[in-house]
């Protein structure tokens, strides 16, 4: 119904007041909810109202506005310090301590990140967007440089329907249209082998705590996972004579081991060092993940970022020991 | 199949010393996180000590501090517990056990060995 | 250090029986709270970890709820294997602390 220049939706009814023709809902159930395109931000609760706009957010401090959209700083929050001394001795020792595992604490000292000290470092958002990893979506927090929320802003995270298939299938040779979804890391990119690569710039050098046999045999499985958390596809990268880049790691062992290994006499045919794990070095091919969506990394940094922020949760799955982004073309270093 | 295999207890006198073994199988021993625990008799677990082999850092109960000492050979992949000074209230079972959370020490303990006894006593 | 009081130290129960196990720690340890069972002369087992994750391989009818300072252990339908001490185990700060024990006879 219409009254003068007011347009009613459907439902409403329209009532002359004092102060001119208003829409009026009688029955919410009958009219448009406010509520339906989700206006509240920042998880604030919407509620159906019987007048414009037809709705009202309740909203979660710090966030106020008719939409939630306004951050409200606390007054006077005193800067978070890691005052603990016991945090002071352990830091860097190469163990997470989850008490020390926190932003004043630098990560334990980057012990909990895979060595960096503050992977929010580029995140220029007025939140602290490292205590925004809360299972629902920070629009603040919403940026490659804040590390896209965690993802958390892709609506609800779908799983792998045939994950235990997909994983067996996945990156061998062959398409399967079943794993040809984000959530399954796009079959290993089996369904796009005549697409052009689409290359983040930069690479990841990984360290982790296996082989170069073993990671190798596993690399499938490896760059799946590793694939999963960054939402785009991983390759091994390959040197100037096309050898998988895949070096063997001997790691950095504290003070007090070096000490305990050079006093141990070495056995006949004992090798001087041994391999502790890996450095591999891996590149972000996007050719999926810019056609179906729009959290991809442009370059390395924000990615290896990520996936010390999972490390920081604890929710990696291979023994990772440190990230780092390099933006040239790396010599072999180890 | 993770396994994890203590030996070297025994009797011993206060202020005699012993060296307990852990040895690991079925994993790759330097990703994981290994502690000690102890048992007195008739009484609760008692966390004793932590290494991460990878790095080698340890951590120690203060009741131990000073007169234990953990190690790990990753050659060979196994724990080692020196202790010395030991008084009789140190008797008790000894179990490693790795930790699920590859360097966190702040993670559970999800396999264990079948344990060690250190008695103490004149 | 933090400590970690379990309550009962001791109770009898009968097959079938719900049974609910508490453990209070002297300050917050979030949720890096285990629960362990073990049997006379065996090494302790893990049943739940991160206050509320079962272990690979144990039953559905063992839970663990809580956070914070107070944790639950509940055993919904008990069964003649599950007749065992059972222990909680902060992994907050080291040094970790275990509870004294709770003991699950048969009524």
């Known amino acids: 119904s219409s009254c003068g220049q007011v347009k009613c939706r459907k439902g409403e009814q329209c009532v002359h007041t004092a102060s001119g023709p208003r829409c009026f809902c009688p029955s919410p159930r009958d009219c448009e909810s406010g509520c339906a395109s989700s206006p509240c931000q920042h998880g604030g609760s919407c509620h159906p109202q019987r007048q414009p706009p037809y709705y009202s957010c309740q909203c979660a401090p710090p966030f106020s506005g008719s939409r939630c959209e306004l951050y409200t700083a606390p007054p006077s929050t005193p800067p978070a310090t890691c005052l603990s001394q016991y945090c002071a001795d352990k830091a860097r020792d190469g163990v997470c301590d989850e008490a020390c595992n926190s932003h004043a604490c630098q990560w334990d000292g980057g012990d909990c990140s895979l060595t960096m000290e503050n992977p929010w470092a580029n995140c220029s958002s007025p939140l602290p967007c490292w205590d925004y990893i809360n299972n629902q979506c920070d629009e603040l927090c919403n940026t490659v440089e804040c590390l896209f929320d965690n993802f958390e802003c892709q609506g609800n995270s779908k799983t792998c329907k045939y994950d235990k298939y997909c994983a067996d299938h996945f990156k061998d040779n062959h398409c399967d249209q079943g794993c040809n979804s984000e959530e399954c890391g796009w079959d290993g990119l089996d369904c796009a082998a005549d697409q052009p690569e689409n290359l983040a710039e930069g690479t990841l050098v990984i360290v982790v705590l296996m082989p170069p046999e073993q990671l190798l045999q596993d690399a499938r499985s490896f760059l799946r996972a590793l694939g999963t958390l960054l939402h785009t596809n991983l390759r091994i990268k390959r040197d100037s004579q096309g050898e998988l880049m895949v070096y063997p790691y001997y790691g950095e062992k504290s003070a007090a081991m070096k000490k305990q290994r050079m006093t141990r006499r070495s056995l006949p045919g004992e090798q001087e060092q041994e391999v502790a794990g890996s450095k591999v070095f891996l590149e972000i091919d996007n050719r999926q993940c810019v056609q179906d969506s729009d959290h991809c990394f442009k370059n390395t940094d924000a990615a290896a970022a990520l996936l010390a922020s999972h490390a920081i949760q604890g929710t990696l799955s291979y023994p990772l020991v440190s990230v780092v982004s390099e933006s040239l073309t790396p010599e072999r270093t180890q | 199949e993770v396994q994890l295999v203590e030996s070297g207890g025994g009797l011993v006198q206060p202020g005699g010393s012993l060296r307990l073994s852990c040895a690991a199988s079925?994993?790759?021993?330097?990703?994981?996180?290994m502690s000690w625990v102890r048992q007195a008799p008739g009484k609760g677990l008692e966390w004793v000590s932590y290494i991460y082999p990878y790095s080698g850092a340890t951590y120690y109960a203060d009741s131990v501090k000073g007169r234990f000492t953990i190690s790990a050979d990753t050659s060979k992949n196994t724990a080692y517990l020196q202790m010395n000074s030991l008084r009789a209230e140190d008797t008790a079972v000894y179990y490693c056990a790795r930790h699920s959370g590859y360097y966190r020490i702040s993670s559970a303990m999800d396999v264990w060995g079948q344990g060690t006894l250190v008695t103490v006593s004149s | 250090d933090i400590q970690m009081t379990q309550s009962p130290s001791s109770l009898s129960a009968s097959v079938g029986d719900r049974v609910t196990i508490t453990c209070r720690a002297s300050?917050?340890?979030?949720?890096?709270l285990a629960w362990y069972q073990q049997k006379p002369g065996k090494a302790p087992k893990l049943l739940i970890y991160?206050?509320?994750i079962r272990a690979s391989g144990v039953p559905s009818r063992f839970s663990g709820s809580g956070s914070g300072t107070d944790f639950t252990l509940t055993i919904s339908s008990l069964q003649p294997e599950d007749f065992a001490t059972y222990y909680c185990?902060?992994?907050?700060?080291?040094?970790?602390?275990f509870g004294q024990g709770t003991k699950v006879e048969i009524k």
């Open positions: 185990q902060q992994y907050y700060i080291s040094p970790s602390t």
């Open positions: 300050q917050s340890v979030r949720s890096f």
């Open positions: 991160r206050a509320s």
């Open positions: 079925g994993y790759s021993f330097t990703s994981y996180g």
